[in-house]
Interface confidence: low
Amino acid sequence: IWELKKDVYVVELDWYPDAPGEMVVLTCDTPEEDGITWTLDQSSEVLGSGKTLTIQVKEFGDAGQYTCHKGGEVLSHSLLLLHKKEDGIWSTDILKDQKEPKNKTFLRCEAKNYSGRFTCWWLTTISTDLTFSVKSSRGSSDPQGVTCGAATLSAERVRGDNKEYEYSVECQEDSACPAAEESLPIEVMVDAVHKLKYENYTSSFFIRDIIKPDPPKNLQLKPLKNSRQVEVSWEYPDTWSTPHSYFSLTFCVQVQGKSKREKKDRVFTDKTSATVICRKNASISVRAQDRYYSSSWSEWASVPCS
Amino acid sequence: RAVPGGSSPAWTQCQQLSQKLCTLAWSAHPLVGHMDLREEGDEETTNDVPHIQCGDGCDPQGLRDNSQFCLQRIHQGLIFYEKLLGSDIFTGEPSLLPDSPVAQLHASLLGLSQLLQPEGHHWETQQIPSLSPSQPWQRLLLRFKILRSLQAFVAVAARVFAHGAATLSP
């Protein structure tokens, strides 16, 4: 058993049929010594008396808010949550496996630049009685500070018969050094509580590996005289690290016909312009990637050819 | 060429070669497309590689103030990785074909380090750790990790030289 926060405790249980469970001793936070009784949740049934209560925690029915009273007055509470371990593996019932980029990916994170700011998100099908708490650091043995905000519900989607809820959180490294080569990864820890079930999820990454620039901005076409060619130009996204002479991007320019089956013409360039042939009903798209480190490409920015 | 306290390096040449190094580091890794590194586990690892850290002066402001600190650090890293790529980890079984990206990477690391340091002048270099993998699979894992860390190192070096070529070239 360990303390998650004040008056909230997590009991770690091996979860299998007829498991013995864990013996837990609760102590009433009071100077009083006698006349103390204990109840669980809203029930008025007295579970025991005395300053301490010993219980065998085996299942969710044994978890909940234990309250000690004296003469009708509440003295203190202890909320017991359960953390299940099945076949040696901690349960992951609350969050959905996103399966990208690999199986057992519950948390996904992205950064728009090297400033030390990043966003993580996760999915669940649970709509109520759900709380999240997020902590982060750089490195684990001698951790350096990363400050995370509160997790918020950022999207709702319907998937077949189910509703899916996306939560996200923004974090910022306290003393970020954008130009340095990271040697210790960022660690992100999410505590999830659904009713009386506790689970924790972790992710470890370097900012450089989760970089995904915003799409290029101000995408424009300029027809060239007496030619089917056009000059496409664009700018670095506002959110990208500066100076651009140091934090450089490379770009992919694509000409795509109306039909998905039509052959795509692609050009790669380090410049912020390119000359391409504009076909009728086609569109021109540009995306960006860090020039020197192969992290994710941005989403496409597009304009129609006409 | 970068002599401590002396003249500037050939920024444009360094920029071109460091960008080539980035391309090579990514084409060389993974050496086989069939290795799936999930979690690092407790296998032998490469913690001792030199990293370009915050105080090394490789940020735009530090380069403007005095690029020598950063160039010395980059040089040290290039020599370190050049030695690693020439060690038993990369020369042992399973052996690499002579035209593999690793062979080109090795040559380019040497080329860039020589651009930064003329003959006869010696900056202090870091000892390479004694990583002696016992069998081919461990060698593959070490190659994988070394190349992954080299990708991060050469990305910073390439940014330094790109910025230098754009803003510090005479």
Partner: antibody
Framework: QVQLVQSGAEVKKPGESLKISCKGS????????IGWVRQMPGKGLEWMGI????????WYSPSFQGQVTISADKSISTAYLQWSSLKASDTAMYYC??????????WGQGTLVTVSS | DIVLTQPPSVSGAPGQRVTISCTGS?????????VHWYQQLPGTAPKLLIY???KRPSGVPDRFSGSKSGTSASLAITGLQSEDEADYYC?????????FGGGTKLTVL
């Protein structure tokens, strides 16, 4: 003594999933990689892939990449080979073998997998 | 597709010497990769016979020896005995996997 003990023979239908195991004993499991080798009826040996003792690195033969999954659980000194959807052509004897300084110096007894409708 | 070529069968009388060849290419044996040999007795799992071109694991009689030259390797068995009747496989590397030869059936006449 040093041995690798494999799970028993399996008879399956096409499309079914299967996971076979290979348990090491009598040596330090965490020093050795475990490889899997297929032998189709009356045919030669084919290397499928190998896994590090912690299960953190798998390396597949190009011919088997995406066809099978190799995993390991160091805590119980066991390596696994699994299929999500078997085909009749997966009918074969499957051997596990350990690799350290010497290549595949100890082999399991083999698991015969028969896939037939 | 087999990238190491072995003769499908060889035979010899008891007491004789036989050799089994294993021919590769510049992308496996010729690249400096080691060659290993395995023996598979009927109905049993393979057993390591020779590793690192010519090294014998403990317990393997010195009647078995291996050698390698250029892009090929060979296994020699002297003083042939009836219990040597088995399939023999050579093995090496390519840049992307371990490869086995097609196997050679040794018959003791």
């Amino acid at each position: 003594q040093v041995q690798l003990v494999q799970s028993g023979a399996e008879v399956k239908k096409p499309g079914e999933s299967l996971k076979i195991s290979c348990k090491g004993s009598g040596y330090s499991f965490s020093n050795y990689w475990i490889g899997w080798v297929r032998q189709m009826p009356g045919k030669g040996l084919e290397w499928m892939g190998i896994i590090s003792p912690t299960g953190s690195v798998t390396w597949y033969s190009p011919s088997f990449q995406g066809q099978v999954t190799i995993s390991a659980d160091k805590s119980i000194s066991t390596a696994y080979l699994q299929w999500s959807s078997l085909k009749a052509s997966d009918t074969a004897m499957y051997y596990c073998a350990r690799w350290y300084y010497k290549p595949f110096d100890v082999w399991g007894q083999g698991t015969l997998v028969t896939v037939s409708s | 597709d087999i990238v190491l070529t072995q003769p499908p069968s060889v035979s010899g009388a008891p007491g004789q010497r036989v050799t089994i060849s294993c021919t590769g290419s510049s992308s496996n044996i010729g690249s400096g990769y080691d060659v290993h040999w395995y023996q598979q007795l009927p109905g049993t799992a393979p057993k390591l016979l020779i590793y690192g071109n010519s090294k014998r694991p403990s317990g393997v009689p010195d009647r078995f020896s291996g050698s390698k030259s250029g892009t090929s390797a060979s296994l020699a068995i002297t003083g042939l005995q009836s219990e040597d009747e088995a399939d023999y496989y050579c093995s090496s590397w390519t840049p992307s996997s371990v490869v086995f030869g097609g196997g050679t059936k040794l018959t003791v006449l």
